[in-house]
């Protein structure tokens, strides 16, 4: 009965087997059943899935564009990944929204002890943050370099100015 | 100019380019350029995009091939960021939009993202940035100090 919304017919693009395959693969990447995966392992995870949910490597940019929510520690919730991959297959539709809601309700109800999580960023925002961090880091390293060059120049001049005193 | 890019950067650009080259003909439309660049973490304005297109789309046919795209990205990466661009970069981490970033948040960002600073570098950065030692960094002033000639 799992996920029988949008999986009634065998001709449907997504079936119960696909969701089972997702969770079986998930278990290998999250053996402690935390429900989260490190962003750094996401590329390997989606490449390990079978069609139609698989996103083959190179897939880093694709995963950025999926705009997945991330929680502190750069971790992503399994449901958010499953929703995004399902959306890739089914497209954006009312049917997709209904499936997402059903899956979410079933998942939360089946795991009533799990703490609800608060995403702080997304994969797309994180990429932008990376680029912005690099701008600041490069500017600061340039500043350090210029400052050390000025100091060296000052020391050089100072030592030469005083050299005629002997 | 593309030889100034690392293998990793070229691979990333290739992936982004291919993702939006829907029909696989080796070109993207100038309309898609913004989307491609955003997927690479850039946030160009419409005016900036137009300037880039004018530079590389010499024949004006509204498409860009990968070598042209690579040249454009290499140019963008080579350019030294202006004071305003660095201020904009800081603004991304200013969640409250009040012109301040906590020293702790700045340390976290600088040592966990991008071209990570060493502990020594970040200690020095915070010493310079948090002048009064109240744990808050006024990044407007810090950027001015950093970019002063």
């Amino acid at each position: 009965e799992n996920f029988n919304v949008a999986t009634e017919e065998s001709s449907e693009p997504l079936g119960e087997d696909d969701f089972e395959m997702f969770y079986e693969t998930w278990e290998k990447f999250d053996p402690d059943a935390t429900q989260f995966i490190a962003y750094s392992r996401l590329s390997d995870f989606v490449d390990t899935l079978q069609e139609p949910l698989r996103i083959a490597k190179p897939n880093k940019i694709k995963l950025i564009t999926l705009d997945l929510p991330m929680v502190p520690g750069d971790k992503i919730h399994c449901l958010d990944i499953l929703f995004a991959l399902t959306k890739e297959v089914l497209g954006d539709s009312g049917e997709m929204d209904a499936l997402k809601q059903t899956m979410e309700e079933k998942f939360m109800a089946a795991n009533p002890s799990k703490v609800s999580y608060e995403p702080i960023t997304t994969t797309l925002k994180r990429k932008h943050e990376e680029v912005c961090a690099i701008k600041i880091q490069r500017a600061y390293r340039r500043h350090l370099l210029q400052r050390s060059m000025k100091q060296a120049s000052y020391m050089y001049r100072h030592s030469h100015d005083g050299s005629g005193d002997d | 100019m593309a030889d100034q890019l690392t293998e990793e950067q070229i691979a990333e650009f290739k992936e982004a380019f291919s993702l939006f080259d829907k029909d696989g003909d080796g070109t993207i439309t100038t309309k898609e350029l913004g989307t491609v660049m955003r997927s690479l973490g850039q946030n160009p304005t419409e005016a900036e995009l137009q300037d880039m297109i004018n530079e590389v789309d010499a024949d004006g046919n509204g498409t860009i091939d990968f070598p042209e795209f690579l040249t454009m990205m290499a140019r963008k990466m080579k350019d030294t960021d202006s004071e305003e661009e660095i201020r904009e970069a800081f603004r991304v981490f200013d969640k409250d939009g009040n012109g301040y970033i906590s020293a702790a948040e700045l340390r976290h960002v600088m040592t966990n993202l991008g071209e990570k600073l060493t502990d020594e570098e970040v200690d020095e950065m915070i010493r310079e940035a948090d002048i009064d030692g109240d744990g808050q960094v006024n990044y407007e002033e810090f950027v001015q100090m950093m970019t002063a000639k």
């Epitope: 009965e1 799992n2 969770y23 399994c78 089946a110 009533p112 002890s113 799990k114 703490v115 | -």
Partner: nanobody, 124 residues
Framework: QVQLQESGGGLVQPGGSLRLSCAAS????????LAWSRQAPGKQREFVAS????????YYSGSVKGRFTVSRDNAKETVYLQMNDLKPEDSAVYYC?????????????????WGRGTQVTVSS
Amino acid sequence: QVQLQESGGGLVQPGGSLRLSCAASGLTFANYDLAWSRQAPGKQREFVASIGVTRNPPYYSGSVKGRFTVSRDNAKETVYLQMNDLKPEDSAVYYCAAKDASVTVATIEDYPYWGRGTQVTVSS
């Protein structure tokens, strides 16, 4: 081994109430998520309610929300389902299920431990 034993079912008139109990043995009860599920003749088993080990509020299916209340007594190793304002469509066999709270599953169907069920019939 793990055993779940439901009780408290029976025949009740529409608008009436029943309280189901599920006694557990063979597991560290306080560490287990518990759920109630039901199955009417010729229909698929459906989720009713679940309760965890943390302070999170319980979950209820839309069809029973506001009428049913799930609770647990760790000392007695028992989970309860208080059913008020019963309707004919609530008639079904009610099952109790359990899983280790530290384990994540996709749906209630994946719970490893199930009771044999207790029949609830709502009829005038």
